[in-house]
Interface confidence: medium
């Protein structure tokens, strides 16, 4: 069976002028997934991103996340790229900044 992920992008304020954008994929199966941030359509290098483990979410499906820091005002240059079971998609940064606990 294949269950496509639900992808959600959120922003959290880190410090003045900088924000952390987090891309979360949830409720997907099987567990193999590619989740990465792109800037100007190009994947960011690994040293500028942080990934969460792919974990079971208790419903027989999985969840994970990837985060990166960006400068406020440049949100439109960033998208979260997801690839899962032959399907892929890009998800833009909304621009809404939420006050969330940072993964960094």
């Amino acid at each position: 069976r294949t269950v496509p992920p639900m992808v959600n992008v959120t922003c959290s304020e880190v410090s003045e002028g900088n924000i952390t954008v987090t891309c979360r994929a949830s409720s997907f199966y099987p567990r193999n997934i590619t989740l990465t941030w792109r800037q100007d359509g190009v994947s960011l290098s690994h040293n500028t991103q942080q990934w969460g483990d792919v974990l079971p979410d208790g419903n027989g499906t999985y969840q994970t996340w990837v985060a990166t820091r960006i400068r406020q005002g440049e949100e439109q240059r960033f998208t979260c790229y997801m690839e899962h079971s032959g399907n892929h998609g890009t998800h833009p940064v909304s621009g809404k900044v939420l006050v969330l606990q940072s993964h960094w």
């Epitope: 002028g17 792109r38 359509g41 190009v42 994947s43 960011l44 290098s45 990166t68 960006i70």
Partner: antibody
Framework: QVQLVESGGGLVKPGGSLRLSCAAS????????MSWIRQAPGKGLEWVSY????????YYADSVKGRFTISRDNAKNSLYLQMNSLRAEDTAVYYC??????????????WGQGTLVTVSS | DIVMTQSPLSLPVTPGEPASISCRSS???????????LYWFLQKPGQSPQILIY???NLASGVPDRFSGSGSGTAFTLKISRVEAEDVGVYYC?????????FGPGTKLEIK
């Protein structure tokens, strides 16, 4: 080995048009962002335009915005620069370059040999 | 736009001697991801430019280790520990932080 070969340069009158091409080989072209950089005779380097691997992100220098159009054909491993309303100050050698500043190690790590565009009446 | 300046604009050097080129940016090139988006290129006479240093201090593949890059957010230095005849050409710094990408005016290194 990696090769970028520009073509399409030449002499054109002010107000005229030219289309530059860059043929890429030796690497997976569709994975690379590309940029055009130009160099006026005896002068320094000037970034002109950027296009992402899928063509969904495009940027231009203010000096060419509205006159130049960058595009790519991944099936043909080719990059293009359509130049309209040319001015004398557009006279330069135009270089096609790969652009990998986000991914891996480099920024502009491969450059073509350049093609000369001369705008003169 | 971010303005890049370089000094000196001309640099005569004796082979075997060290050389140093300075580059400054009008705005910090340190990104919040902790990378500094400053690059050095060399354009040898009659050739296309080639990359020397990426992200301020990383030596590009195939570049001799006599080249090194250092700096802070707005002030950068390219050093050649021992200049060789093949090092002649124009050295450019470039900011790759934001559009439009901008280059310094170039420093012409020549052999005395």
């Amino acid at each position: 080995q990696v090769q970028l070969v520009e073509s399409g340069g030449g002499l054109v009158k002010p107000g005229g048009s030219l289309r530059l091409s860059c043929a890429a080989s030796g690497f997976t072209f569709s994975n690379y962002a590309m940029s055009w950089i130009r160099q006026a005779p005896g002068k320094g380097l000037e970034w002109v335009s950027y296009i992402s691997p899928g063509g969904d992100y495009i940027y231009y220098a203010d000096s060419v915005k509205g006159r130049f159009t960058i595009s790519r054909d991944n099936a043909k491993n080719s990059l293009y620069l359509q130049m309209n309303s040319l001015r004398a100050e557009d006279t330069a050698v135009y270089y096609c370059t790969t652009d990998r500043r986000h991914y891996g190690s480099y920024a502009m790590d491969y450059w073509g040999q350049g093609t000369l565009v001369t705008v003169s009446s | 736009d971010i303005v890049m300046t370089q000094s000196p604009l001309s640099l005569p050097v004796t082979p075997g001697e060290p050389a140093s080129i300075s580059c400054r940016s009008s705005k910090s090139l340190l990104h919040s991801n902790l990378n500094t988006y400053l690059y050095w290129f060399l354009q040898k006479p009659g050739q296309s430019p080639q990359i020397l240093i990426y992200r301020m201090s990383n030596l590009a593949s195939g570049v001799p280790d006599r080249f090194s890059g250092s700096g802070s957010g707005t002030a950068f230095t390219l050093k050649i520990s021992r200049v060789e005849a093949e090092d002649v050409g124009v050295y450019y710094c470039m900011q790759h932080l934001e559009y439009p990408f901008t280059f310094g005016p170039g420093t012409k290194l020549e052999i005395k």
